[in-house]
Each structure stands twice: as structure tokens, then as C-alpha cells.
Interface confidence: low
């Protein structure tokens, strides 16, 4: 038994009356006194119960007593109006002891055989209490063997009195310009033996003002001031309270940014507290006027410490800080009622002059030098040599400070050389090479580099040859001496160009055969273009319905003539197209291999011979005119022929260009 | 540490030409807005002119719009002022200064943060 | 042009006394006033900006005050190297302009 050595006797037994279970004697008294451990009360019940009934039990009775209180007095076989008999009921001690009181008179009418009771000792459940009684603990109690102990919610801590529950109430910061704070358990009654500390913190220049709302009610005392619980509210200038009682205090106004809030409660009483809203006031700062053209974000109806504004212009206009651009914009009050930064402006955009334009020039539209916000210039390209590509030349100021487009695009605009330009009229003579005039073949470039060749200019920066022509010098552009704008072969009056890179066709072979006989050559500056250079146009897909048998082409250069020596001018000389057949039947017989002539070549020449180009020519440009645009274009490059220039039944093989133009146009769109 | 070293001054005539560079060193150049002040005994300091951390913009004072011309190298974290059509009241010392990190603040600043030792610039006849 | 006027144009000071220089705008230039320290034979040194804000490596007895179109720079416990001509800036409007300064000097 868990009773230890101060409880040797048991605490469960047995009474009866004296002589039980025969009858008692009369004159009896008998006193029995039960005491159970600390924590633990008597339980009493009886299996047998006869004693003589008498008015409110005064002869013969058991009387059942806990310390100086009186459970039962009990007497006769069954209860009536005014007497009590056990029958079946239990008996509860109040504390750990029980009184037994067993008594007879003088006399008995007729024999009773008394009483026969059982008692034990049994746990307490100090949880246990009666309706309208104070409950044991404040929170939550725990019965065990021998005691009970409270315990209490999250937030609250057991006092020393072991029942009551205080309050974790202190240490609360507040520091948000406003708020709420309140009793514990508010609007439910505040906890007991508590004292809660609330501190209100803001940044200095801040002022804090306080407003009770709701109720009030907190125990007071008619005579003395707030003697039980109380509210106090302090600030680094003054105390405001003690406040109790049910009259909300009046708003208080601290003109301090700091301020403590103290709350005690003694062990009684049953109010609902009390709840405060604070909010906070500051030196406000002038009020912030929208620059011309900007607005202010957020509009407030005033701006006090730690408020901000930003600055927005309105599309088209920039902020400007003095005279320096801003990304953004944003000022912040400051404890001393001023802001933190300068108003900017907001100035409209100016794209600023617009870029030169290469080969083109500008022109303002809007006004003389107007460059600001939804002004418009023109690009337009230098007449006659140049023409503008894809594009309108009408370039619009954008909010972003960019000159753009109408199609969105803030790059300049492209001067595009005109091609296939000559001062030549046609149908000359056929027979007989000639000497070329000024501006008659201004795409003519010469190639000099180990031997003499020709090209011809491609757009401004690009020269169309023959691959055999430049490939020994595939691998070292810079090799390659490259003239144009002249007629005469050794003349000092030239435009130079050097060359930044060859391009030689990937199935071209060298020494075995002349397929794809083609090669581009990109030139390290553009070249500018006037009367004397001028590019040739590539062929059209329909072009070849100006290249059929018989057509007219006419090849130039500065090749051998029928003398022997390369020519001093520039000659030219007007051949027609041969059928492919009988060119390819031409170079069919030997030292010719077969299939020397391809589908990638085409001839030109006289049956009767006398009329050819020759070395020195190689890479020069067979060109034809396309009658709708008047405008010459490339048909063939210079490539091989027979033995003897000029052979009769052999004619002068070109690389077929218009078989390369998906070639020529991925090379020069990738570099 | 931060460094500024101008050079180019001396005596010129009116109306002749003079440039002066600053060499920067010790700090981001290409951070940095750039100007350059003057100080006269008389007139004491004048800011002349300042360039943007990436050169796309100039601003002068009303006084030396065209005529001076500030620009810089960004490679060589040099700034230069050519002066031309000089007058003898562009007499002064010619200070090189950052005007503070393009990026501080969200915003540009307008204060001095660094100085040269200046170089002085004499337009006599 | 935002004029600025400091005064007085010239303070005579012991070292150890503490003192305040004044500048004053023709307009408001809400906090955009700087003040340099420029000593003799020396370029001008950057020591407050935005009116109040102090520099890294400026010492903390120079501090600025002021707002709108009046401001301070008030130098506490005066050393014998604090001895110079002090300048005030602003920044406020787009042509950048300077005060003509105040010298302080050993009395």
C-alpha cells in the first residue's frame, strides 16, 4: 500500500453493533473514529440496518459526523417523513476522517439486531465540484491517488498559490506606425495575479496616440483609487492612471514615440478588461507637387515621417534630377518634416541627332533640328546609285529615346547600291572586240595576284569571280590586288579594294574540270558607288528568258587579244548564246575529257570563231539585259574554253550564275 | 585609393585652343559620371561641364557651350575637356572630379566626391 | 541662377571653440546643399552631402543642418587642421553653383 508508516492501520473494514448480529443491549454507546491519508475520503455503506424508529431518531441512533459537520442520524428499518434509515445508500466523508456514533436508550419495545456497516478508504477527485462552487484550478486540473495539481493554457504560468493562472503578459513590442493591443482573454474577464507590460516603440519623430474603444471594466472601489486592478500608461514626459472602473478613459495624446502600458490584476473579481487602439502622428512634409508632365504615386491627403512618393512622367518625358536622368524616383519624409531628395522634372525625350546615314542623308520633318519626343525625320539614299531598303525612311522619337521605324525598328536604314547601271546603249556590233567607253561595264573589277583576272561588284562590298581565278589565294586574301573604277589596265587612277576573305564554291575542284567555277571574294570596306562603279544585278528568276540560244551577252576584260598580250583597255565584245547541246558535242572530242561541259555551264560564242573571251578575262562577268527593269545582270563568269581563243567550232564556257544564287545569297547573308 | 591627375594646362592667346586630360585610377572610371570645375579668385568655383558614366550625354554651363568640349575613354579611364575660342575669362584652375556612381541611390547626384590636384589654364595676349 | 550666400565671409576662431558657418539659398533647394573644406594650396574635399549626411572618412566633429533655403555647417571642438576655406554647393537646379565661401582663420 502506497500509505507509508504514519498509516499502519487499514483503510477498509468492517462495523457493527455491539452483539450483532444477535440483538443490542440497551444503554449503548459506542464511538468510532475512521481517518484515511491526506487526499483520501471514507467511503460507508450498510448490508444490515435495525434500529428502534423513534421521532427524529432521539432513542436509538447511528450518526454519521466529518469534522464538526453532521452527515446523517439514522434509526428504524426503512426512512419515513421525518427519519432517515440508510437502506442503500453510501456514505462519503467531507475530509479524511469519519465519525461513527452508535447509541441506545433505556428501553426497546421489542429486540433489534442492530447494524453491520463496510468502510474504505478511496481517492479524492479534488476536480470534482459541487455546481456554483469555485472550481479547484483556473485552467486545467489533474486528480491522482492522493492529490490533485493544476496546470494552465499556453500563455499563462501556475502561480505560487498553485491554483491560479497568471498571465504571460509582458515583453510585447509594438513597433507598426498603428495597432491593437488589449487585456488578456479580452472581451472574456482578464486572468487573475497577473501583471502585463506592453510597449509601444516607433521611430523617433513619430508621436503616439491612444484611443480606448469598446468597453471598460476593470475592478475598482467605491472610496479608494483602484486599489485591486489597474492600468497604468507611461511615457518618457509623464504617467497617465491609474485607470479602473467602467468609464472608457478619454483618447491620450503622448507627443512621445515611446510608451509602456502596465496592467496588474489581484486574485478576485470577474471583468471583461479593456482594449486600446493606438495610432501615431508625425511632422508632415510639404505637400509634393507633380512636376509639368509627371504625377505624384500614391496621392495622400498628407505625407508624414517614413511616407514616400515616386515621380512618374508621362509617356514620353523623362525624369530628370538637375540635369541628369533618373531610372526611378522616390522621396521619403523625414523626421524633421523635409523630404529626403529634390522634386525632378519630368523633360521630355530627345532621341538626340540623328545617325548619318551612309550613302543617304536626313532630314527633319517636324521642325529644323527638332529631335524631341514624336518628332519625325526622313532618310532618304543618294539618287541614282542608291536605293533604300525595305524600309520607308520615316523614323519617329519613341518614348525610349530611340529614332524607330514605322515598322519598329530602331537600326538605320540600308543605302542599297543600284545595280546594273551602264552608260552603254545596245545593239552595237556583234563582230569585233571593242574597247569599252567610261561607265559601260562599271561593275568590272581586276583581280591581280600571280596572274590577271576579272570579277564584277556585287552590291557594295562584294566582287562575283571564278574559283579558279583565286585559288591560290583562298587561304591568303590579303594577296589580292583589286582595282576598280577604271578602263585602262595600268592606269594609276583607280579605286583600290583589298580583300577580307574568298569564298570558293565547295564543289569546285581544282585542276579537274570547271564545275561550280564560282567564288566570292568580301571586300574589307564598302566601295562607294558613282557613275564608274556601279555593282551588276544577280539574275532574276525569270531571267532566263533573256539567256535562250541566240541571245545577246556581252563579256569584258582585259584579257589576250588576238595580238597575244593582255589588253591596255578594257574591251568588250557581244556574243550570242550557244545551244547546250552542241556545246557540249564540241567538247565532247578529245584533249577534251567527257562531260567537260555541265549543266552548271553555259556558251557563248561564234560558230565561225574570231569572237571569245580569253585568259585574263577568267572571272568577269558575261552579262545580259533584262528589257523589263533596263537593268544589266550576271548570266555567266568567265571559266574555260578551247586551246585557242577565238577557235572556230568552239565557243567560251561561263559558270551558269543563276544555278549559284541560293549559294551566293546564304554566303553573303552570313558574313 | 582614389587618384586624379590632370595635365595639358599652361598659357594660351585668346581665341587659340587648349586641351586638358585626367587621368583616373583607384576606382571603377566606367562607374562614374565625371565633370570638371574651375576656381578663379574672383569667381571662386564654377562647375564647367559633366559627362555620363557611358558618354552618352554632355551637359555644360551656358557659358562654354560651344566652345568646350568634354569627353572620355573609357579603355584608357581618361577624361578630357578641349577648350577652344578661349577667353580671358576661362583663366582659372581646372580641377577633374567624379561626380558619384552612376547606380547610388536610384538616382545621380550631383556632388564632387573625388578631386584632382588641378591644373591651372592662362588665357593672355 | 540659385545664388548662395555664406557668412560671415571670414570666422576667427581658437582651437577647441566650436562654431557654425551659415548658407543661405536665393530659393529653396530642399536638402541639396553640400559643403566642401578646401585648405590652402589643396583641391576642395567633399565633407557633408544632402544637407546633414556625413562622409566615410570625414571626422564626426563636421555636421550639417537645415532645409529650404538656410543651412549650417557647424564644426564642434575646432582643431588647428579644420583651419581652411569652406565651401557650400548645390545641386538642386541644373546649373550646379557654389557659395563664395568662408574662411576660417586662427584668431
Known amino acids: 500500500t502506497p500509505l507509508g508508516p504514519k498509516w499502519p492501520e487499514p483503510v477498509f473494514g468492517r462495523l457493527a453493533s455491539p452483539g450483532f448480529p444477535g440483538e443490542y443491549a440497551n444503554d449503548q454507546e459506542r464511538r468510532w473514529t475512521l481517518t484515511a491519508p491526506p487526499g483520501y475520503r471514507l467511503r460507508l455503506y450498510f448490508t444490515h440496518f435495525d434500529l428502534e424508529l423513534s421521532h427524529l431518531c432521539e432513542y436509538d441512533f447511528v450518526k454519521l459526523s466529518s469534522g464538526a459537520k453532521v452527515l446523517a442520524t439514522l434509526c428504524g428499518q426503512e426512512s419515513t417523513d421525518t427519519e432517515r434509515a440508510p437502506g442503500k445508500d453510501t456514505f462519503y466523508s467531507l475530509g479524511s476522517s469519519l465519525d461513527i456514533t452508535f447509541r441506545s436508550d433505556y428501553s426497546n419495545e421489542k429486540p433489534f439486531t442492530g447494524f453491520e456497516a463496510f468502510y474504505a478508504a478511496e481517492d479524492i477527485d479534488e476536480c470534482q465540484v459541487a455546481p456554483g462552487e469555485a472550481p479547484t484550478c483556473d485552467h486545467h486540473c489533474h486528480n491522482h491517488l492522493g492529490g490533485f495539481y493544476c496546470s494552465c493554457r499556453a500563455g499563462y504560468v501556475l502561480h505560487r498559490n498553485k491554483r491560479t493562472c497568471s498571465a504571460l503578459c509582458s515583453g510585447q513590442v509594438f513597433t507598426q506606425r498603428s495597432g491593437e493591443l488589449s487585456s488578456p482573454e479580452y472581451p472574456r474577464p482578464y486572468p487573475k495575479l497577473s501583471s502585463c507590460t506592453y510597449s509601444i516603440s516607433l521611430e523617433e519623430g513619430f508621436s503616439v496616440i491612444l484611443d480606448f474603444v469598446e468597453s471598460f471594466d476593470v475592478e475598482t472601489h467605491p472610496e479608494t483609487l483602484c486599489p485591486y486592478d489597474f492600468l497604468k500608461i507611461q511615457t518618457d514626459r509623464e504617467e497617465h492612471g491609474p485607470f479602473c472602473g467602467k468609464t472608457l478613459p478619454h483618447r491620450i495624446e503622448t507627443k512621445s514615440n515611446t510608451v509602456t502600458i502596465t496592467f496588474v490584476t489581484d486574485e478576485s473579481g470577474d471583468h471583461t478588461g479593456w482594449k486600446i487602439h493606438y495610432t501615431s502622428t508625425a511632422q508632415p512634409c510639404p505637400y509634393p507637387m507633380a512636376p509639368p508632365n509627371g504625377h505624384v504615386s500614391p496621392v495622400q491627403a498628407k505625407y508624414i515621417l517614413k511616407d514616400s512618393f515616386s515621380i512618374f512622367c508621362e509617356t514620353g518625358y523623362e525624369l530628370l534630377q538637375g540635369h541628369l536622368p533618373l531610372k526611378s524616383f522616390t522621396a521619403v519624409c523625414q523626421k524633421d518634416g523635409s523630404w529626403d531628395r529634390p522634386m525632378p522634372a519630368c523633360s521630355i525625350v530627345d532621341c538626340g541627332p540623328p545617325d548619318d546615314l551612309p550613302s543617304g542623308r536626313v532630314e527633319y520633318i517636324t521642325g529644323p533640328g527638332v529631335t524631341t519626343y514624336k518628332a519625325v525625320i526622313q532618310y532618304s539614299c543618294e539618287e541614282t546609285f542608291y536605293t533604300m531598303k525595305v524600309n520607308d525612311g520615316k523614323y519617329v522619337c519613341e518614348a525610349d529615346g530611340f529614332w524607330t521605324s514605322s515598322k519598329g525598328e530602331k537600326s538605320l536604314p540600308v543605302c542599297e547600291p543600284v545595280c546594273g547601271l551602264s552608260a552603254r546603249t545596245t545593239g552595237g556590233r556583234i563582230y569585233g572586240g571593242q574597247k569599252a567607253k567610261p561607265g559601260d561595264f562599271p561593275w568590272q573589277v581586276l583581280i591581280l595576284g600571280g596572274t590577271t583576272a576579272a570579277g564584277a561588284l556585287l552590291y557594295d562590298n562584294w566582287v562575283l569571280t571564278a574559283a579558279h581565278a583565286v585559288y591560290e589565294q583562298k587561304h591568303d586574301a590579303s594577296a589580292l590586288d583589286i582595282r576598280m573604277g577604271t578602263l585602262k589596265r595600268l592606269s594609276p587612277h583607280y579605286t583600290q579594294a583589298w580583300s577580307e576573305a574568298v569564298f570558293i564554291h565547295e564543289g569546285y575542284t581544282h585542276d579537274a574540270g570547271f564545275d561550280n567555277d564560282i567564288a566570292l571574294i568580301k571586300l574589307n570596306n564598302k566601295v562607294v558607288i558613282n557613275s564608274n562603279i556601279t555593282p551588276i544585278c544577280l539574275p532574276r528568276k525569270e531571267a532566263e528568258s533573256f539567256m535562250r540560244t541566240d541571245d545577246i551577252g556581252t563579256a569584258s576584260g582585259w584579257g589576250l587579244t588576238q595580238r597575244g598580250f593582255l589588253a591596255r583597255n578594257l574591251m568588250y565584245v557581244d556574243i550570242p548564246i550557244v545551244d547546250h547541246q552542241k556545246c557540249t558535242a564540241a567538247y565532247e572530242k578529245p584533249p577534251y575529257p567527257r562531260g567537260s561541259v555541265t549543266a552548271n555551264m553555259l556558251c557563248a560564242g561564234l560558230e565561225s570563231g574570231g569572237k571569245d573571251s580569253c585568259r585574263g578575262d577568267s572571272g568577269g562577268a558575261l552579262v545580259f539585259l533584262d528589257s523589263e527593269t533596263e537593268r544589266w545582270f550576271v548570266g555567266g563568269i568567265v571559266s574555260w574554253g578551247s586551246m585557242n581563243c577565238g577557235e572556230a567550232g568552239q565557243y567560251g564556257v561561263y559558270t551558269k550564275v543563276i544555278n549559284y544564287i541560293p549559294w551566293i545569297e546564304n554566303i553573303i547573308s552570313d558574313f | 585609393e582614389v587618384q586624379l591627375v590632370e595635365s595639358g594646362g599652361g598659357l594660351v592667346q585668346p581665341g587659340r585652343s587648349l586641351s586638358l586630360s585626367c587621368a583616373a585610377s583607384?576606382?571603377?572610371?566606367?562607374?562614374?559620371?565625371m565633370a570638371w570645375v574651375r576656381q578663379t579668385p574672383k569667381k571662386g568655383l564654377e562647375w564647367v561641364a559633366t559627362?555620363?558614366?557611358?558618354?552618352?550625354?554632355?551637359y555644360y554651363r551656358d557659358s562654354v557651350k560651344g566652345r568646350f568640349t568634354i569627353s572620355r575613354e573609357n579603355a584608357k579611364s581618361t577624361l578630357y575637356l578641349q577648350m577652344d575660342s578661349l577667353r580671358s575669362e576661362d583663366t582659372a584652375t581646372y580641377y577633374c572630379?567624379?561626380?558619384?556612381?552612376?547606380?547610388?541611390?536610384?538616382?545621380?547626384?550631383?556632388?564632387?566626391?573625388?578631386w584632382g590636384q588641378g591644373v591651372m589654364v592662362t588665357v593672355s595676349s | 541662377n540659385i545664388v548662395l550666400t555664406q557668412s560671415p565671409a571670414t570666422l576667427s576662431v581658437t582651437p577647441g571653440e566650436s562654431v557654425s558657418l551659415s548658407c543661405r539659398a536665393s530659393?529653396?533647394?530642399?536638402?541639396?546643399i553640400h559643403w566642401y573644406q578646401q585648405r590652402s594650396n589643396e583641391s576642395p574635399r567633399l565633407l557633408i552631402k544632402?544637407?546633414?549626411r556625413s562622409i566615410s572618412g570625414i571626422p564626426s566633429r563636421f555636421s550639417g543642418s537645415g532645409s529650404g533655403t538656410d543651412f549650417t555647417l557647424s564644426i564642434n571642438r575646432v582643431e588647428s587642421e579644420d583651419f581652411s576655406i569652406y565651401y557650400c554647393?548645390?545641386?538642386?537646379?541644373?546649373?550646379?553653383?557654389f557659395g563664395a565661401g568662408t574662411k576660417l582663420e586662427l584668431r
Open positions: 572630379s567624379t561626380e558619384s556612381p552612376y547606380y547610388s541611390e536610384g538616382y545621380y547626384q550631383g556632388y564632387f566626391d573625388y
Open positions: 583607384g576606382f571603377t572610371f566606367n562607374d562614374y559620371n
Open positions: 559627362i555620363l558614366f557611358d558618354g552618352s550625354r554632355t
Open positions: 530659393q529653396s533647394v530642399s536638402t541639396s
Open positions: 544632402y544637407a546633414s
Open positions: 554647393q548645390q545641386s538642386y537646379s541644373s546649373l550646379y553653383t
